[in-house]
Structures are given as C-alpha cells and as structure tokens.
Amino acid sequence: APVRSLNCTLRDSQQKSLVMSGPYELKALHLQGQDMEQQVVFSMSFVQGEESNDKIPVALGLKEKNLYLSCVLKDDKPTLQLESVDPKNYPKKKMEKRFVFNKIEINNKLEFESAQFPNWYISTSQAENMPVFLGGTKGGQDITDFTMQFVSS
C-alpha cells in the first residue's frame, strides 16, 4: 500500500543539525550559512504501528538513499544504526518494527521513540560533533527533543 511521506531536516533542541559521518553514521553539530547544505534530508513516512492516543508511527529514511534508521540490539544494548534496504520495497506501510519510531509532538518539539525498544529515543549529546544514538533516558544530559522543517526540492 502507498504511504504518505515528506522530506524534512531535523535539528535538536540546541539547534544542532544532523550530518553524515561516514557511510553508516549520523553526527550532530552546529552549522551555519552554506554549511547548512551538509545536513541530511530525511524522507519521513507514515507507517503502521501500535494503537496509541498520542504517538504517530513513522520511518526515517535518508532521502534518495536506500538507508533507514533502525534499532537493533548490539552487545545486549538497544542501538541506532543506518541500515541498507532494497529501494524497490521501501518505504512500505508495514515496515519491520526495527524501522518504526513513535513520533511524539509536544509544543512543536518532536521526540522519536523506538517502537522496538519502548522508552529509548533518538538522542544527541550536548557535545559537538558526536554521533546520533539511541538513548534510554529522557530529561537528562542527552537531548531527545527535535524540531522539523520541510525541505523544498
């Protein structure tokens, strides 16, 4: 079944942008001016998820790349990774659970909770130039709030 998708950029609540760091990792850092063109453009898709009153299930792909953010166990710890997929089959309404994030919007701020690992969130560090990761705490040192902006193609 077809899915609703959009193109967007994400910035954390400290206004750090997300950029590629090697082929399979994202990092967060402050960008200005022409450097803003480095930030990754996501293709966010509305997918099937578990019933909820305040969470909207989405998948986060990298625009025009066959890469999706996914959540897997590595060394017994929930971990965020970029995973290659067959572009002929993605995005799809029924995404595998590791690709699904529950988007939670509060006061124009977005959180992305892993559907596979409840209470684990896409996170950034306070420090500059650090990897984007899956964090198991909210409201602590690490940042779990993001803003989204559409990207015009």
Epitope: A1, R4, S5, N7, F46, K93, N108, F150, S152, S153
Partner: antibody
C-alpha cells in the same frame, strides 16, 4: 493565534480554471501540513488533498489530475489550482491545518471561499 | 479507498438527552478516527481525535470510543449549543483522508 484566510473564490464558467489562496498566520508552513476540503451546497465535507513539503502532495482519487496544491512558504500561502471546472465543483472551499504531522486531523480552519461554476 | 458510513443521517433529540452517533469504516483503521462539529455557514471544528482523545477546549460531555472499523461519538447530556452536523473522518488509511457523510442533529 492561528489564522487561515481563503481568497480567490467567485463565479467561473464550466471548463474554466481558478486558483484559490489560503494565507496563514500564527504558525509556519515550514513545519505544518495543509489540506483543502470542500463542501457543496447542502452536502457533506469532501477532502481534496494535502501538502507537506512542496514535493509531497497527496490527493483524493477523484481530485487527481484536475486539482493541484502548492505553497509559497515565504508568503505564508497555500494554493489550490482547479482546472476543467464543472458544475459539480460548485462548493465552499476550506483550507485546514493538520494538527500534527501525519495525524490526519485538522485543528485550524479558514472561513471558506465560495466557488460557483455556472454559465 | 476506505469508505466511512455514518448513522443515522439525521437525529432529533432534546436538551438533556444522551445522543450516540456511529461511524463505520469499510476496513480496519485502528484508532485513526476523528470527529468534527459543524454549524451552518461555519467551518468545522475538531472535537475528538484518535477515536477517543478530546481536542483542546472541547466540553467533557463529548466522548468518543471504538477501534478497528466501528466507532461512536457520544454526547452525554445535550446542550442547546450542540445542535449541529457531526462528521467522522478516517485519518490514517493509506494516503487518502475521508469523511463520513454527516449526521444532522436537530431539535425534537
């Protein structure tokens, strides 16, 4: 305060074209999706389509081809281009804001603009 | 495309009555359903989203329930301001968003 104001409605001949505008304030089109909905006289609500970013628009099956939604974020304005108009397109046309991205529901509406298709 | 069917199409009731409007989807939409109220010459107003969550500023006499393909809107004690037309809306079925045909609530 969230405000949406439609304009551009009026009388148009069958086969003609019309472009409606929806100018918004109190929020940014760079982070909210916008739908167009119409209501024929004495009839129910009919969803036309929705726009996210400029490349991501979705339409009701009956609207594909004749109706096009676009936007100019710098002007805080969303447009509905209507072509090959027919008498049955006579309706009040509303723009509406999606409450949250992909929520589908609409928490802010304009007052509507009347389009009459008649010779 | 998913078709939304409301019943009844018209409903007459008195102030203080308990009123129930139903909405049926042609296939399961989980809890992706909203309800709107519309008065003549006015824009619709969002009442309930995700089948049961009250929108901001909506009185608690309104409630929604259901999941899958069967949904209800209940007004526990009808007030004079509640006479209007009510619409259900599928918000999550694929790329398309569809309204029911409406239920007109009139004074008995």
């Amino acid at each position: 305060e969230v405000q949406l104001v439609e304009s551009g409605g009026g009388l148009v001949q069958p086969g003609g074209s019309l472009r409606l505008s929806c100018t918004v304030s109190g929020f940014s089109l760079s982070s909210y999706a916008m739908s167009w909905v119409r209501q024929a006289p004495g009839k129910g609500l009919e969803w036309i389509g929705i726009i996210y970013d400029s490349a991501s628009t979705y339409y009701a099956s009956w609207a594909k081809g004749r109706f096009t939604i676009s936007k100019d974020t710098s002007k805080n304005t969303v447009y509905l281009q209507m072509n090959s108009l027919r008498a049955e397109d006579t309706a009040v046309y509303f723009c509406a804001r999606e409450r949250q991205i992909f929520s589908g529901d609409m928490d802010g509406w304009g007052q509507g603009t009347l389009v009459t298709v008649s010779s | 495309e998913i078709v939304m069917t409301q019943s009844p199409s018209t409903l007459s009731a008195s102030v203080g009555d308990r009123v129930i409007i139903t909405c049926q989807a042609s296939q399961s939409i989980d809890n992706w359903l909203s309800w709107y109220q519309q008065k003549p010459g006015k824009a619709p107003k969002l009442l309930i989203y995700r089948a049961s969550t009250l929108a901001s500023g909506v009185p608690s006499r309104f409630s929604g329930s259901g999941s899958g393909a069967e949904f209800t809107l209940t007004i526990s004690s009808l007030q004079p301001d509640d006479f209007a037309t009510y619409y259900c809306q599928n918000t999550g079925g694929g790329v398309s968003i569809a309204f029911g045909q409406g239920t007109k609530l009139t004074v008995l």
